[in-house]
Interface confidence: medium
């Protein structure tokens, strides 16, 4: 178990030109917060995908009121770490996704607004027990400068938060099999701590996260009797040789706890040990209030003045989820119509259409020839959604109208005269070379140089030229 | 029932060599931690040894680490301690014992003991 | 390692009476990250093997009587027999399996 631990320096604008509008006004003050999403691997996972290892939310920062005809400066930010707990291993590659949002402060009905400000993702290598990694990404014209690192929680050590350390019992030795925990070293290694609700009683482990049963029982975290179904005693221990290991209904049969928690049996019933943030019998009641600002993507929050109230978030156009945390991916129905670009706005969708089509979503075939005539005989040619002309000799260009002058380009090597001609350029060659752009030097023997072979090709072998 | 028989014990000279087994039945054998716990005549219980359900993890106490050997033999569900260079102080009843469950645990079962006695 | 001092070494008392054997830890034998107290009770009676009493602090074994009973946390543990049985005269170990494996010296609960 452990803590990513992100500490946001400055969000402000990145270099170069086209500074960013100040997010706040005079009109319109507001404040940032952050969002930070881990998830487990080097994964290219879509933004919406849950946040495996954990997420977290900033505190709100100061009110921001934009200084007329000023720059937007880096804007304040709140105090504090964003912790992201962990309780398993560390896994030493990680996606992220950071989040800066608006919380605009005007007079708004139902409270205040939300907007996505920017959002930058990267892929990391981080071993935990690290120092703090620096980081500087860029979301379109703003610039986020942060440092992370991630922390094993005692008793945990290692680069995986896997090694389980105590202060040792003695100054020179730690106990049998417990090896010292370097650079801790007046630590010692300490018991794996099992599978969260592994039963004390009948489950036990030999490696972190693990759960094994005693004989008689059974489950995921052994809370489960095995019965006798031919056997004498219906719910007492069976030997492993009789043959009649039959799971046994047990209270915890199919996991009653919802939103992650573990279940334990108790002696009359079952017993839920609740994630942070829920509570209930079976811990289905969740503890976040829109106090706690839990719609993202500008979701609107009703409800949930208490805890014991849920609240429910209105999602905009183009978001979904219990949380408006998952961006609507419209664009996968392929909407834009002859190979227009589909551009996923928030707000709108928007089809870029390719040359030779037009409407909302490119259904419209424009005639490119209609109406555009080519100059000096040239003839209009259509395909693929874009026009182009045939030119007659000597002419060139888009619409046929430049002369073309097949000697501007100089194709004549080595100091040769180029000719216009009807039938398109001749070189006269300087003496001493030859060939159709004078590109061969004549020897003095009269053979001529001609270019080496390229590999794989023997002299003589005439696609050389080609 | 779960038994755990101890046997090898006996009288050896100081720097000699003995090998204790303990045969176990009664339970999955392969499923649990095992240690061997010793105690001198009139006196308390020390741990000496044990090791883990697939033999892969073994644990001493400092005072016979480095002569003795902690070993099974799953297939044929037998314990068995390595005790070499012995010294007068290793007199004692060794008992074989089972954990609850892995290394982590109480030990929850004994066998009756074999008695070691080191002496010129 | 962790040293376990056992008070008294010997307890007289009679049939019928309360028993109540302490067992100190020169350090904590609780577990943060599971909240167990990674300590047991044996009873060893002469020319026997030990028994499983306690584990856990608190947990009796399977076929303990409920008069056995242990409470505690941390460095201080008690082993409480609520009413003392003819059979219960024995001696005592208390045990832990924290950090190393080490015992207490052990209470006799003898006959008075």
């Known amino acids: 178990a452990g803590v990513f631990e992100l500490q946001i320096h400055s969000f402000g604008p990145g270099p170069g030109p086209g500074a960013p509008r100040s997010p706040c006004s005079a009109r319109l003050p507001c404040r940032l917060f952050f969002r930070v999403c881990l998830k487990p691997g080097l994964s290219e996972e879509a933004a919406e995908s849950p946040c495996a290892l954990g997420a977290a939310l900033s505190a709100r920062g100061p009110v921001y009121t934009e200084q007329p005809g000023a720059p937007a400066p880096d804007l304040p930010l709140p105090d504090g770490l964003l912790q992201v707990p962990f309780r398993d291993a560390w896994p030493g590659t990680f996606s992220f996704i950071i989040e800066t949002w608006r919380e605009e402060l005007g007079d708004q009905i139902g409270g205040p607004a939300w907007s996505l400000l920017a959002r930058v993702a990267g892929r990391r290598r981080l071993a935990a027990g690290g120092p703090w990694a620096r980081d500087i990404q860029r979301a379109g014209a703003w610039e986020l400068r942060f440092s992370y690192r991630a922390r094993c929680e005692p008793p945990a050590v290692g680069t995986a938060c896997t090694r389980l350390c105590r202060p040792r019992s003695a100054p020179s030795r730690c106990g049998p099999g417990l090896r010292p925990c370097a650079p801790l070293e007046d630590e010692c290694e300490a018991p794996l701590v099992c599978r969260a609700g592994c039963s004390p009683e009948h489950g036990f482990c030999e490696q972190p996260g693990e759960c094994r049963c005693l004989e008689g029982w059974t489950g995921p975290l052994c809370t489960v009797p095995v019965s006798t179904s031919s056997c004498l005693s219906p719910r007492g221990p069976s030997s492993a040789t009789t043959g009649c290991l039959v799971p046994g209904p047990g209270p915890c049969d199919g996991n009653p706890c919802a939103n992650g928690g573990s279940c334990s049996e108790t002696p009359r019933s079952f017993e839920c040990t609740c994630p942070r943030g829920f509570y209930g019998l079976r811990c289905e009641v969740s503890g976040v209030t829109c106090a706690d600002g839990p719609c993202f993507n500008g979701g609107l929050c009703v409800g949930g003045a208490d805890p014991d109230s849920a609240y429910i978030c209105h999602c905009p156009p183009g978001f979904q989820g219990s949380n408006c945390e998952k961006r609507v991916d419209r664009c996968s129905l392929q909407p834009c119509r002859n190979g227009g670009l589909c551009l996923d706005l928030g707000h709108a969708l928007r089809c870029r259409c390719r040359a030779g089509f037009a409407g909302p979503r490119c259904e419209h075939d424009l005639d490119d020839c209609a109406g555009r005539a080519c100059a000096n005989g040239g003839t209009c040619v259509e395909g693929g959604g874009a026009h182009r002309c045939s030119c007659a000799l000597g002419f060139g260009g888009r619409d046929c109208r430049e002369r073309a002058d097949p000697c501007a380009a100089r194709p004549c090597a080595h100091g040769g005269r180029c000719y216009a001609h009807f039938s398109g350029l001749v070189c006269a060659c300087a003496p001493g070379y030859m060939g159709a752009r004078c590109e061969f030097p004549v020897h003095p023997d009269g053979a001529s140089a001609l270019p080496a072979a390229p590999p794989g090709l023997r002299p003589g072998d005439p696609q050389r030229y080609l | 029932e779960v038994q755990l028989l101890e046997s090898g014990g006996g009288l050896v000279q100081p720097g000699g060599s003995l090998r204790l087994s303990c045969a176990a039945s009664?339970?999955?054998?392969?499923?649990?931690?095992m240690s061997w716990v010793r105690q001198a005549p009139g006196k308390g219980l020390e741990w000496v040894a044990a090791?883990?359900?697939?033999?892969?993890?073994?644990y001493y106490a400092d005072s016979v680490k480095g002569r003795f050997t902690i070993s099974r033999d799953n297939s044929k569900n037998t314990l068995y301690l390595q005790m070499n260079s012995l010294r007068a102080e290793d007199t004692a009843v060794y008992y074989c014992a089972r954990h609850r469950g892995g290394f982590y645990y109480a030990v929850d079962y004994w066998g009756q003991g074999t008695l070691v006695t080191v002496s010129s | 390692d962790i040293v376990l001092t056992q008070s008294p070494a010997t307890l007289s008392l009679s049939p019928g009476e309360r028993a109540t054997l302490s067992c100190r830890s020169s350090q904590s034998v609780l577990y943060s990250s599971n909240q167990k107290n990674y300590l047991a009770w044996y009873q060893q009676k002469p020319g026997q093997a030990p028994r499983l009493l306690i584990y856990?602090?608190?947990s009796r074994a399977t076929g303990v009587p409920a008069r056995f009973s242990g409470s505690g946390s941390g460095t201080d543990f008690t082993l409480t027999i609520s009413s003392l049985e003819p059979e219960d005269f024995a001696t005592y170990y208390c045990h832990q399996y924290l950090s190393s494996r080490t015992f207490g010296q052990g209470t006799k609960v003898e006959i008075k």
């Open positions: 009664g339970f999955t054998f392969s499923s649990y931690a």
């Open positions: 856990w602090a608190s």
């Open positions: 090791i883990n359900s697939n033999g892969g993890n073994t």
